[in-house]
Amino acid sequence: EPPTACREKQYLINSQCCSLCQPGQKLVSDCTEFTETECLPCGESEFLDTWNRETHCHQHKYCDPNLGLRVQQKGTSETDTICTCEEGWHCTSEACESCVLHRSCSPGFGVKQIATGVSDTICEPCPVGFFSNVSSAFEKCHPWTSCETKDLVVQQAGTNKTDVVCGPQDRLR
């Protein structure tokens, strides 16, 4: 009685259960009554990551430096290459097919979370008592200078973009 289903790591062909090719190898010829499945290793820059009956291996992903990409981990015969972005850039999608420059936080805003290879900079408005006077992808909001601790008084109030200006206390004559 010919089988209708096969064991794990096997496939049904011509009413017969043949062994699948292991990861890193492709199918050359199906098994027969007298011969085993014939498999061949994937070539240079190729891979197959599952037990398979593929006749062609997949090409490793190319991390194109012109798109801001670099190789995070090189592919093997069983795994694809993993791309990520060069320093100062982040992926535009989960597949990381291209990169864009990290955004900077404008004056009045500080960095809440520094960008990574896969996520952009997260900015936040500087709350009362804090300021940022630069456009930066790294700088957080800085606290206003405390004039009191320096035995000075506030001569000019701070804003979300400027620090307070301290000055000497008026002496009573």
């Epitope: 240079e44 820059s45 670099r70 190789v71 995070q72 981990q73 090189k74 290879g117």
Partner: antibody, heavy 114, light 110 residues
Framework: QSLEESGGRLVTPGTPLTLTCTVS????????MGWVRQAPGKGLEYIGV??????ISYYATWAEGRFTISKASTTVDLKITSPTTEDTATYFC??????????WGPGTLVTVSS | AVLTQTPSSVSAAVGGTVNIGCQSS????????LAWYQQKPGQPPKLLIY???TLASGVPSRFKGSGSGTQFTLTISDVQCADATTYYC???????????FGGGTEVVVK
């Protein structure tokens, strides 16, 4: 971003030695890290690399069994299993794949002598 | 893999041009995983060119890389006294175990 090797010293043949590469500002889960050596007055010799995500180490054919590369969160180690006088060299730690452009540490000198 | 670098030594006059060849016994990864490094005495190698022809950050445009597959060339034009040192090519392959360096080329500037 910087990397610095340490652990290089004078050892007697057969005494295992571990060199450490300490990184700063480099995410080791995002970069492959390799080791290269250079005997005095000679050329550069590739030892091996440890992959970023998988942490699997790959070695030059000649280096297989003679060296072990491993990593922690901010360090990458190179263990010289059983040094011989031929292993006298400056050992460099490198960020990235050699053939795809890499950043190098200043190196650490290992002298093997009885 | 084997990387054969030629010549092992070359001399040039200031302002002249130098060509260094690098031949691989098999194709490098993606046909372009070939880097060029400059090494001055007592210093670690410094990256000049990667992906066969991409100039590394901060490297003068006098340095130019070309080639693909198994044949590569580093060209230094308008040679300066500071260029007098040793240059290495390095190849990356499908298998990381095959990564290798060329034997080096010493550039002498007259």
């Amino acid at each position: 971003q910087s990397l610095e090797e340490s652990g290089g010293r004078l050892v007697t043949p057969g005494t295992p030695l571990t060199l450490t590469c300490t990184v700063s500002g480099i995410d080791l889960s995002s970069y492959a890290m390799g080791w290269v050596r250079q005997a005095p007055g000679k050329g550069l010799e590739y030892i091996g690399v440890i992959a970023s995500n998988s942490g699997i180490s790959y070695y030059a054919t000649w280096a297989e069994g003679r060296f072990t590369i491993s990593k922690a969160s901010t360090t990458v180690d190179l263990k010289i299993t059983s040094p011989t006088t031929e292993d006298t060299a400056t050992y460099f730690c490198v960020r990235g794949y050699i053939g795809d452009g890499a950043l190098w540490g200043p190196g650490t000198l290992v002298t093997v002598s009885s | 893999a084997v990387l054969t670098q030629t010549p092992s030594s070359v001399s040039a006059a200031v302002g002249g041009t130098v060509n260094i060849g690098c031949q691989s016994s098999k194709s490098v990864y993606y046909n372009n995983w070939l880097a060029w490094y400059q090494q001055k005495p007592g210093q670690p190698p410094k990256l000049l060119i990667y992906r066969a022809s991409t100039l590394a950050s901060g490297v003068p445009s006098r340095f130019k890389g070309s080639g693909s597959g198994t044949q590569f060339t580093l060209t230094i034009s308008d040679v300066q006294c500071a260029d007098a040192t040793t240059y290495y090519c390095a190849g990356g392959y499908s298998s990381d175990s095959d990564t290798t360096f060329g034997g080096g080329t010493e550039v002498v500037v007259k």
